[in-house]
Interface confidence: low
Amino acid sequence: LSPQPGAGHDEGPGSGWAAKGTVRGWNRRARESPGHVSEPDRTQLSQDLGGGTLAMDTLPDNRTRVVEDNHSYYVSRLYGPSEPHSRELWVDVAEANRSQVKIHTILSNTHRQASRVVLSFDFPFYGHPLRQITIATGGFIFMGDVIHRMLTATQYVAPLMANFNPGYSDNSTVVYFDNGTVFVVQWDHVYLQGWEDKGSFTFQAALHHDGRIVFAYKEIPMSVPEISSSQHPVKTGLSDAFMILNPSPDVPESRRRSIFEYHRIELDPSKVTSMSAVEFTPLPTCLQHRSCDACMSSDLTFNCSWCHVLQRCSSGFDRYRQEWMDYGCAQEAEGRMCEDFQDEDHDSASPDTSFSPYDGDLTTTSSSLFIDSLTTEDDTKLNPYAGGDGLQNNLSPKTKGTPVHLGT
């Protein structure tokens, strides 16, 4: 059946999703809302104005915020079961050219596994072009470059992150499809570990080449808020983070990788029902600007600054933050106009400290993630082999050959 690359292009009614959780508190038009009560003890990314560093802290109940549907990086729209568009957003994997569809036999027959897949196109996630992702059996896609033990913590696209066990039933499959303009992962007839009697779940996440993300839900046999998170986090939404390499006090020549979640959209789990869908449309980010003039004159909700030495526009809060800091971009941009840079040679600079994206320990332990709110430890494993699925393996040699323990 022929592919359906154009699914979900039309506009629809406004969203009913309520976003919770991490937002950039210093640059966000969040509104206080006494009428909407969010979960207590949810994490909030805040700026430590004293030392200029970032830390995860917890908002007390009386400061709970509900963020409007414009989430700075994305606009989300909910389509309920009665909306025709919810059906249109479902990508018909059965219609795809068979060469573009893979039933991932390993993920379809195991529990708490993840496997790296290479996309046929650059997918812009929070403004970052990504070429490889990691599909997990637990109803989410890990979007990070570096595999670590806390996959479920951040850098995810999660239509329904939960303790799914595709190995429970022969009917359960994890299918993915890539036609060059859309990449779809479908968790098909998967069961919740320990809740098999509730029935099977069928849902999908679609990553469109233009940056749109669609969650479509076909079969959701139970109320999502009732799903237990004691063994595995239960989340629906998006998250991204940056990594900072810190000198390790124990081994001075090594650097410890710390992960900081800079943005999260958590969807109201009660809205996840059979035949509903949600579409995330990306908003412009600083990263898209390729010149100083465009950067400095941009009318975004972000405070965009131009770093001449990197020839990059940034708010300072994206995956390139390490470079932004290493090259002194934050200081360089202060009070300067584009004409100030015109006579400077941007090729001669060097960073304050040497930086390689694969410095440090790839199997980062939970203690080196400054995310205090995590309560459960997962034993999701990455399958580093291509096996019989024709999957390309782009893992660092350090991780090749043995499964890497991953976690919440």
């Epitope: 059946l1 022929s2 359906q4 039309d10 079961p81 009665s82 909306e83 025709p84 568009h85 919810s86 059906r87 249109e88 479902w90 018909d92 994997v93 059965a94 219609e95 068979r98 039933i103 022969d170 009917n171 499959t173 299918v175 479908q186 098909d188 007839h189 069928t202 076909k218 035949m275």
Partner: antibody, heavy 120, light 107 residues
Framework: EVQLLESGGGLVQPGGSLRLSCAAS????????MSWVRQAPGKGLEWVSS????????YYADSVKGRFTISRDNSKNTLYLQMNSLRAEDTAVYYC?????????????WGQGTLVTVSS | DIQMTQSPSSLSASVGDRVTITCRAS??????LNWYQQKPGKAPKLLIY???SLQSGVPSRFSGSGSGTDFTLTISSLQPEDLATYYC?????????FGQGTKVEIK
């Protein structure tokens, strides 16, 4: 209860036209794809055409391509099949079927059918 | 087009018998196979989708199995009301195609 009720069948001469209708009830019509499947007398089933929920996507069997047009009016919960340039081999009972176009594209509910006879 | 071939074309069995109908695809179709029952003078009814998933409301005596090119519909204990013609259908690629049908009669 899902119900599909076809109408519009009858006797028509070769080269003639006919428009079939299928009135749907018992489900949210606009959220489902719909299909036409036909069955010649004493023969098996043959898929004819499908249309997605919004009407934006249509598909046809080679045997009817260019002659038949599938359409829908979601405000009336009605599916249509406009049949032009009819041939003797188009004689069949025409069923409309609700189509689950998830992973397995199954026809999960069927109407009772309407007979189209093409004969001179 | 993918050809679907069913066998046998007809069979006769007694009430309580185990009945097996096979469907073969001209090329591998993974599990993209559905089964339908059509009683005399009636419209078809979906029994099994995705090769082995039982449609809601269908008696559990019906089951499906197989993947790739070879598929089986099994009626574990034939009942009088199972007198019908059974069709397989592939949804692996357009055009959607059906098998020629298997007529099941009661002895």
């Amino acid at each position: 209860e899902v119900q599909l009720l076809e109408s519009g069948g009858g006797l028509v001469q070769p080269g003639g036209s006919l428009r079939l209708s299928c009135a749907a009830s018992g489900f949210t019509f606009s959220t489902y794809a719909m299909s036409w499947v036909r069955q010649a007398p004493g023969k098996g089933l043959e898929w004819v055409s499908s249309i997605y929920g919004s009407g934006g996507k249509t598909y046809y069997a080679d045997s009817v391509k260019g002659r038949f047009t599938i359409s829908r009016d979601n405000s009336k919960n009605t599916l249509y099949l406009q049949m032009n340039s009819l041939r003797a081999e188009d004689t069949a009972v025409y069923y409309c079927a609700r189509t689950d176009y998830s992973l397995y594209y199954q026809f999960d509910y069927w109407g009772q059918g309407t007979l189209v006879t093409v004969s001179s | 087009d993918i050809q679907m071939t069913q066998s046998p074309s007809s069979l006769s069995a007694s009430v309580g018998d185990r009945v097996t109908i096979t469907c073969r695809a001209s090329q591998s179709i993974s599990r993209y196979l559905n089964w339908y029952q059509q009683k005399p003078g009636k419209a078809p009814k979906l029994l099994i989708y995705a090769a082995s998933s039982l449609q809601s409301g269908v008696p559990s005596r019906f089951s499906g199995s197989g993947s790739g090119t070879d598929f089986t519909l099994t009626i574990s204990s034939l009942q009088p009301e199972d007198l019908a013609t059974y069709y397989c259908q592939q949804s692996y690629s357009y055009p959607v195609t059906f098998g020629q049908g298997t007529k099941v009669e009661i002895k």
